[in-house]
C-alpha cells in the first residue's frame, strides 16, 4: 500500500503566440481546482474509463478576478498535494489524466457552475520511494507544470511497496528469514498477516491468510517437524505433510524479480510473475511498445533493436528524455553572442541584442562609428557595442568637445607644480626631485637616480612631459 502524490506548480499560458484569454473576469470571478485519475500499466487514456489505481480532487484555489486588459497570468492554485492512495502493489508503469476545472462564482442559479478548462494525459514509468519527478504538459494554449512521486505507507517498502517493514524486536538482528529494511536499517522486513495460528518461526505467507511452511516443517500451521528418519536427498520447500527437509531461509530471499514482480521458489531457483507492463524472466524488461504511444511532445517512436528497449523516442528540437518528456533549456547553451539576452519561446529561440549588435544570435557587430563624429580632431574607435572617441591632446569627453585640464589629476609627484601646455603638461619639480612627473629623487652627491640626465637639463629644471 502507498500514496501517489501530485504537486501542481503552475497553470497558465504556454509559451508562444496566441496566449489564452483569462478564464475569469470582473463580471465572472472564478477559482480553479484539479482532478487526477490514475490507471495501472499503459492503459488507454480515455477519460471515461475507470481510474483503476484511484483518483483525487484538489481543494478549490483562491478566487481570481482578471485585471482588465492584462494577459492571462499563471492562475492562483489550491494549496497542498493531491493524494491518491493505492491499496495493492505500485505497478511501476501508470497512465494519468490531470484535469483543470474552473468553478464560476457569478450569480448562477442553483450554485456555482463548473467547466473543464484543460486536460493533460500521459504514460510514465515510476518506482515507488524515488524522488519527485518533474513534468510539463500542454493542453492547447495552456501549460501545466507539476511534480509527482509514489511513496509507500509503512510498513510497506520497496519499488513496488510489496515488502513490509517493522521496528526491530532485537537490537542486533532480524528474525528468521527476515532482512533489514534498506534504507531503514533499524527496521526489519515484516511478514504478511498470515493465517491465524501460523507458526511465526516456521511458517510464512505470500498472500494474506495462507500458511506455507519453511523447509523442515509441515502441518496446516507449520508446527510439525518433518521426520528425518527417511532422509535421502534434501530438496525444495515442503509439499504438504511428507518429505525430508532441512530448515532454511524464507521464500525468494532478496526478491530477485524486478519491477514489482512476485517471486515464488522452485526447488533450485525461483520464478517471477510480472506485473502489467513488464516481462522477461526476471520482469526486467518494460513491455511498453510504440503502440502505447510513449513519446511525448511530437517525438517519433521506433521499435528498439535492443531486447531490453521495446521502443526508442526520437525527440523534436527542444525536448529530451527517454519519452521526450523533458523540455530542453536551450538558453542554457548560451546561444546569444555579445551579451545578448536569450528568450526561449517554445516554438523558437530569440536573442535580444545589446546596442551595437544585431543578427539572429547577435553575432554581427554594427559599425558604431557610422554617422558619428569626434570633435577637435578626435578619432572614433568601435567596440563593445558603443562608439568611443580617442581625443586629441587637450580635449576629452564622449565626443572630445570638452577642453581637458591636464593638471586636474595632479600628475606631478613630490610637490612638483603642474603647468598646462599646448602639447600636454609640464611639471616644475621641487628641489631634490627630477623626471617627467618629478618621480625620481636626486642623490646628495649630485648623481641622479636616472642613468643619465637628458642633455641640456639640470636637476631642478622643469621637465616637460611629452
Amino acid at each position: 500500500a502507498g500514496v501517489f502524490e501530485l504537486q501542481i506548480h503552475s497553470f497558465g499560458p504556454g509559451p508562444g503566440p496566441g496566449a489564452p484569454r483569462s478564464p475569469c473576469s470582473a463580471r465572472l470571478p472564478c477559482r480553479l481546482f484539479f482532478r487526477v485519475c490514475l490507471k495501472p500499466g499503459l492503459s488507454e487514456e480515455a477519460a471515461e474509463s475507470p481510474c483503476a489505481l484511484g483518483a483525487a480532487l484538489s481543494a478549490r484555489g483562491p478566487v481570481y478576478t482578471e485585471q482588465p486588459g492584462a494577459p492571462a497570468p499563471d492562475l492562483p492554485l489550491p494549496d497542498g498535494l493531491l493524494q491518491v492512495p493505492f491499496r495493492d502493489a505500485w505497478p511501476g508503469t501508470f497512465s494519468f489524466i490531470i484535469e483543470t476545472w474552473r468553478e464560476e462564482l457569478g450569480d448562477q442559479i442553483g450554485g456555482p457552475a463548473w467547466s473543464l478548462l484543460a486536460r493533460v494525459a500521459g504514460r510514465r514509468r515510476l518506482a515507488a520511494g524515488g524522488p519527485w519527478a518533474r513534468d510539463i504538459q500542454r493542453a492547447g494554449a495552456w501549460e501545466l507544470r507539476f511534480s509527482y512521486r509514489a511513496r509507500c505507507e509503512p510498513p510497506a517498502v520497496g519499488t513496488a511497496c510489496t515488502r513490509l517493514c517493522r521496528p526491530r524486536s532485537a537490537p542486533s538482528r532480524c528474525g528468521p528469514g527476515l532482512r533489514p529494511c534498506a534504507p531503514l536499517e533499524d527496521e526489519c522486513e515484516a511478514p504478511l498477516v498470515c493465517r491465524a495460528g501460523c507458526s511465526p518461526e516456521h511458517g510464512f505467507c505470500e498472500q494474506p491468510g495462507e500458511c506455507r511452511c519453511l523447509e523442515g516443517w509441515t502441518g496446516p500451521l507449520c508446527t510439525v517437524p518433518v521426520s528425518t528418519s527417511s532422509c535421502l536427498s534434501p530438496r525444495g520447500p515442503s509439499s504438504a505433510t511428507t518429505g525430508c527437509l532441512v530448515p532454511g531461509p524464507g521464500p525468494c530471499d532478496g526478491n530477485p524479480c524486478a519491477n514489482g514482480g512476485s517471486c515464488s521458489e522452485t526447488p533450485r531457483s525461483f520464478e517471477c510473475t510480472c506485473p502489467r507492463g513488464f516481462y522477461g524472466l526476471r520482469c526486467e524488461v518494460s513491455g511498453v511498445t510504440c503502440a502505447d504511444g510513449p513519446c511525448f511532445n511530437g517525438g517519433l517512436c521506433v521499435g528498439g533493436a535492443d531486447p531490453d528497449s521495446a521502443y526508442i523516442c526520437h525527440c523534436p528540437p527542444g525536448f529530451q528524455g527517454s519519452n521526450c518528456e523533458k523540455r530542453v533549456d536551450r538558453c542554457s547553451l548560451q546561444p546569444c553572442r555579445n551579451g545578448g539576452l536569450c528568450l526561449d519561446l517554445g516554438h523558437a529561440l530569440r536573442c535580444r541584442c545589446r546596442a551595437g549588435f544585431a543578427g539572429p544570435r547577435c553575432e554581427h557587430d554594427l559599425d558604431d562609428c557610422a554617422g558619428r563624429a569626434c570633435a577637435n580632431g578626435g578619432t572614433c574607435v568601435e567596440g563593445g557595442g558603443a562608439h568611443r572617441c580617442s581625443c586629441a591632446l587637450g580635449f576629452g569627453g564622449r565626443d572630445c568637445r570638452e577642453r581637458a585640464d591636464p593638471c586636474a589629476a595632479r600628475p606631478c609627484a613630490h610637490g612638483g607644480r603642474c603647468y598646462a601646455h599646448f602639447s600636454g603638461l609640464v611639471c616644475a619639480c621641487a628641489p631634490g626631485y627630477m623626471g617627467a612627473r618629478c618621480e625620481f629623487p636626486v642623490h646628495p652627491d649630485g648623481a641622479s637616480a636616472l642613468p643619465a640626465a637628458p642633455p641640456g637639463l639640470r636637476p631642478g629644471d622643469p621637465q616637460r612631459y611629452l
Epitope: D253, G254, T266, R268, S269, F270, G280, L281, R282
Partner: antibody, heavy 116, light 106 residues
Framework: QVQLQQWGAGLLKPSETLSLTCAVF????????WSWIRQPPGKGLEWIGE???????SFNPSLKSRVTISVDTSKNQFSLKLSSVTAADTAVYYC??????????WGQGTLVTVSS | DIQMTQSPSTLSASVGDRVTITCRAS??????LAWYQQKPGKAPKLLIY???SLESGVPSRFSGSGSGTEFTLTISSLQPDDFATYYC????????FGQGTKVEIK
C-alpha cells in the same frame, strides 16, 4: 534421464553468424529453462542467455545485441544464433537445461572456431 | 552487472585435506548462488544450489555456505576424484560465473 544433443557449424569466418541447435531427449520440454554457456579455450565459463518454454528470453548484457535464442517446442529443440562473430567468439559452446539461471543438465559441447 | 570473484585461482592440496574456496559477489545476491565442478574436456556438473543445498547424487563431503556477498565451498576430505576446476555462479540477476579455482595435486 534427460539428454541434450547439440550440433552446428564448427568453423566460421569473421562477420559470419554462428548457429547451433540443441535437441532434448527423454524429458518434458515445458516448465524448464534452456541456456547457452560458452568457454573460450583455457578460460572460464561465460553465460550467454536462456529461454523458457514460452519463448521469454534473458541475455548477457555484453552479448545481447548479437544474440538470438529461440525454442521449437514441437521438436523439443532450442537454438542459438550469434551474429558478426570475431576471433574472440572462439569457444566451446554448451547447451543446458534447468531451472531459471541454474543449468543442471548439460550438452556435450561444440567447439566453434572463428578464423579467416 | 554483478561480478563474481573467486579465490584462490589455484589451490594445491593432498588427498584427505579440507579444502575451502571463497566466492565474493560485487553486490548482494541473497542465496542465489551455485557451485559447479568441471574436469578437462567435460561439461560442468552442478554441486550446490541456493548457496548451501546439495544437488542429488553429490557426495556429502561437499558443502556450501554464505549469503549476501560472501560464499564458500568446502570439501571436507579431498578425494582423488575431486581434483578439478570449481566455478561459482550467481543467478540473482542474469547469470555470472566466477573465474574458476583449479584444485590440483600437491
Amino acid at each position: 534421464q534427460v539428454q541434450l544433443q547439440q550440433w552446428g557449424a564448427g568453423l566460421l569466418k569473421p562477420s559470419e553468424t554462428l548457429s547451433l541447435t540443441c535437441a532434448v531427449f527423454g524429458g518434458s520440454f515445458s516448465g524448464d529453462y534452456w541456456s547457452w554457456i560458452r568457454q573460450p579455450p583455457g578460460k572460464g565459463l561465460e553465460w550467454i542467455g536462456e529461454i523458457n518454454h514460452s519463448g521469454i528470453t534473458s541475455f548477457n548484457p555484453s552479448l545481447k545485441s548479437r544474440v538470438t535464442i529461440s525454442v521449437d517446442t514441437s521438436k523439443n529443440q532450442f537454438s542459438l544464433k550469434l551474429s558478426s562473430v570475431t576471433a574472440a567468439d572462439t569457444a566451446v559452446y554448451y547447451c543446458a537445461r534447468g531451472e531459471l539461471g541454474i543449468p543442471d543438465n548439460w550438452g556435450q559441447g561444440t567447439l566453434v572456431t572463428v578464423s579467416s | 552487472d554483478i561480478q563474481m570473484t573467486q579465490s584462490p585461482s589455484t589451490l594445491s592440496a593432498s588427498v584427505g585435506d579440507r579444502v575451502t574456496i571463497t566466492c565474493r559477489a560485487s553486490q548482494s545476491i541473497s542465496r542465489w548462488l551455485a557451485w559447479y565442478q568441471q574436469k578437462p574436456g567435460k561439461a560442468p556438473k552442478l554441486l550446490i544450489y541456493k548457496a548451501s543445498s546439495l544437488e542429488s547424487g553429490v557426495p556429502s563431503r561437499f558443502s556450501g555456505s554464505g549469503s549476501g556477498t560472501e560464499f564458500t565451498l568446502t570439501i571436507s576430505s579431498l578425494q582423488p576424484d575431486d581434483f578439478a576446476t570449481y566455478y561459482c555462479q550467481q543467478y540473482n540477476s542474469y547469470s555470472t560465473f566466477g573465474q574458476g579455482t583449479k584444485v590440483e595435486i600437491k
